[in-house]
């Protein structure tokens, strides 16, 4: 909401949900950061360290397997999305430390804060693709035997990335820098040019396409998958299923505050007490959403330890075990042994 409605209450500087309300003071106190900002900085620091190292490790592990294992393709793309977003964190961190002053220029203002939204859309579209893949493996094993391959997986990922870029364009286009004079600083935000309807439209589209619709479809999808899995107890790749469910669940948990505050602020008057309160929590909500960028490697390690019983292997081999599991589809009792064997050769990891 950083829209330059040209009056700014406690401006949360880079995320796109802020409505800049310049008539209200930006800084009531000049030298001390607010508690939510301090918490945001702590989260950013942790996310950056874990996210960069963890996702780099995941990329390294999965890149070698991506030619032959479909699972590796999925996890590689998720890690790239998270890694890219983490690269913006030092800049966002610096901006908060300087009371949201943005000395990095207009291009950086357009690109860097938009990375978290690109990550949101890329992640949810990739998770939707992964979920569709899980669904097909369980319910259409023969189709998977014939058509499921690395080439198709890469095409699906390319489509997901393309759509994510398209959905991020509004944020990118509306982002501008604006000079503040008392005290002197440059702010980075979104300018909806006093158009509250446009601001609401962007917030609603973001909520529906980036949260509600995926939440509904993925919940239905995994309800079917889990029911089938539990009833048949015949899938060897429940390990990957558990990991994917954990990743999907964490996505919705960590994006929830951002989405809720975003939609609320787009409907509230910038002068209202609730708006001003939400504004103060803005950086914290963004940082909470950013946890998505480092949580996946943690999930993989925790899952790996769980499946191993204890951490016996090195981290790369543990991750390889979790992220590159081959899927043997044995859902249908009518499958012959030879079919299963053939599929074990042909079908790549879920």
């Amino acid at each position: 909401m950083d829209s330059f409605n040209y009056t700014t209450p406690d401006y949360g500087h880079y995320d796109d949900k802020d409505t800049l309300d310049l008539n209200t003071p930006v800084d009531k106190t000049s030298n001390t950061l607010r508690v939510p900002d301090i918490l945001a900085l702590v989260i950013f620091a942790v996310v950056f360290l874990v996210g960069v190292l963890g996702n780099a490790l995941v990329v390294w592990v999965t890149a070698f397997e991506a030619k032959r294992t479909i699972n590796a393709i999925w996890f590689l793309n998720l890690a790239v999305a998270d890694f890219l977003s983490c690269l913006a964190l030092p800049i966002l961190f610096t901006s908060i430390v300087q009371h949201h002053h943005w000395p990095f220029g207009g291009a950086a203002c357009s690109i860097l804060p938009s990375l978290i939204l690109l990550n949101m859309y890329a992640s949810i579209l990739l998770l939707a693709t992964i979920s569709a893949d899980r669904f097909l493996l369980v319910f259409k094993p023969i189709w998977c035997q014939n058509f499921r391959g690395a080439g198709l997986a890469w095409i699906a990922c390319a489509v997901a990335w393309g759509l994510a870029l398209l959905l991020t364009i509004p944020s990118f286009l509306y982002r501008v820098v604006r000079e503040e004079y008392f005290p002197p600083k440059v702010l980075c935000g979104v300018d909806y040019s006093h158009d509250k309807r446009r601001e609401r439209a962007v917030a609603i589209v973001r909520l529906v396409l980036g949260f509600l619709w995926p939440l509904l479809t993925l919940t239905i999808c995994y309800t079917f998958i889990l029911l089938r899995t539990w009833s048949r107890r015949a899938t060897r790749s429940t390990k990957t299923l558990k990991v994917v469910v954990a990743v999907v669940a964490s996505f919705f948990i960590f994006w929830l505050p951002y989405q809720v505050t975003g939609i609320m602020m787009s409907f509230l008057e910038p002068s209202s007490p609730t708006f001003l309160l939400l504004k103060k929590l803005d950086s914290l909500c963004v940082s909470f959403a950013y946890i998505n960028c480092c949580i996946n490697p943690i999930i993989y390690v925790v899952a790996g330890q769980g499946f191993q019983g204890r951490l016996r292997k090195s981290l790369p081999s543990l991750l390889r075990n979790v992220l590159t599991e081959e899927s043997v589809v044995r859902e249908s009792k009518s499958f012959t042994r030879s079919t299963v064997d053939t599929m074990a050769q042909k079908t790549q990891a879920v």
Epitope: F4, Y6, T7, L20, L22, N23, P25, V26, D27, K28, T29, S30, N31, V97, Q98, H99, H101, R178, E179, E180, Y181, F182, P183, P184, K185, V186
Partner: antibody, heavy 121, light 112 residues
Framework: DVQLQESGPGLVKPSQSLSLTCTVT?????????WNWIRQFPGNKLEWMGY???????SYNPSLKSRISITRDTSKNQFFLQLSSVTTEDTATYYC??????????????WGQGTSVTVSS | DVVMTQTPLSLPVSLGDQASISCRFS???????????LQWYLQKPGQSPKLLIY???NRFSGVPDRFSGSGSGTDFTLKISRVEAEDLGVYYC?????????FGGGTKLEIK
């Protein structure tokens, strides 16, 4: 050379709105700087009222926020002050001034001559 | 709001003397970027205020070097080393580090 000139009615009735114009010559108000309104009460006390920046963003003194509006006409290189529901307490000399410079060495480097406004019935 | 105290209210001096005006704040006006947005203005009788000093100690173009600014944190001083007749008027300090920006109450420099 940059020059600012205030204009407007010298007498306003209580509860009415006060409207003042600042005409800028020698510099475009859309190029840079914040274009401010400052007033000086009879006892010489100065109060910053608000500004409109070169980009069109506004910032107001919280003590006046509910009553003040600063707008501009870029074609005429003018900016305006509107103060609603005036009382005798708003009797003052009103100045327009330019604030800015090379970040972050900002200051009010050019001022208008001021226009005296009396609020009286 | 930041409370400013400018002293003295009136400062009678002889021409050629040194004059010193103080501006004190209820809290530090050093902004988080390390800059202090403190300015000094002089308003001569019948005129609008004119900028003398910006960012504590920087003289504005055309301002004689007999004017100097100093201070840090909450205490600031404007010094005029040798007062001349053209220096008479009311001096104001101004802070732009906190919202809203505020002017001091003014110090009237007059001939003793």
């Amino acid at each position: 050379d940059v020059q600012l000139q205030e204009s407007g009615p010298g007498l306003v009735k209580p509860s009415q709105s006060l409207s003042l114009t600042c005409t800028v010559t020698g510099y475009s108000i859309t190029s840079d700087y914040a274009w401010n309104w400052i007033r000086q009460f009879p006892g010489n006390k100065l109060e910053w009222m608000g500004y409109i920046s070169y980009s069109g963003s506004t910032s107001y003194n919280p003590s006046l926020k509910s009553r003040i509006s600063i707008t501009r006409d870029t074609s005429k290189n003018q900016f305006f002050l509107q103060l609603s529901s005036v009382t005798t307490e708003d009797t003052a000399t009103y100045y327009c001034a330019r604030y800015g410079g090379n970040y972050p060495t900002y200051a009010m480097d050019y001022w208008g001559q001021g226009t005296s406004v009396t609020v009286s019935s | 709001d930041v409370v400013m105290t400018q002293t003295p209210l009136s400062l009678p001096v002889s021409l050629g003397d040194q004059a010193s005006i103080s501006c004190r704040f209820s809290q530090s006006i050093v902004y988080s970027n390390g800059n202090t947005y403190l300015q000094w203005y002089l308003q001569k009788p019948g005129q609008s205020p004119k900028l003398l000093i910006y960012k504590v100690s920087n003289r504005f173009s055309g301002v004689p070097d007999r004017f100097s600014g100093s201070g840090s944190g909450t205490d600031f001083t404007l010094k005029i080393s040798r007062v001349e007749a053209e220096d008479l008027g009311v001096y104001y300090c101004f802070q732009g580090s906190h919202v809203p920006p505020t002017f001091g109450g003014g110090t009237k420099l007059e001939i003793k």
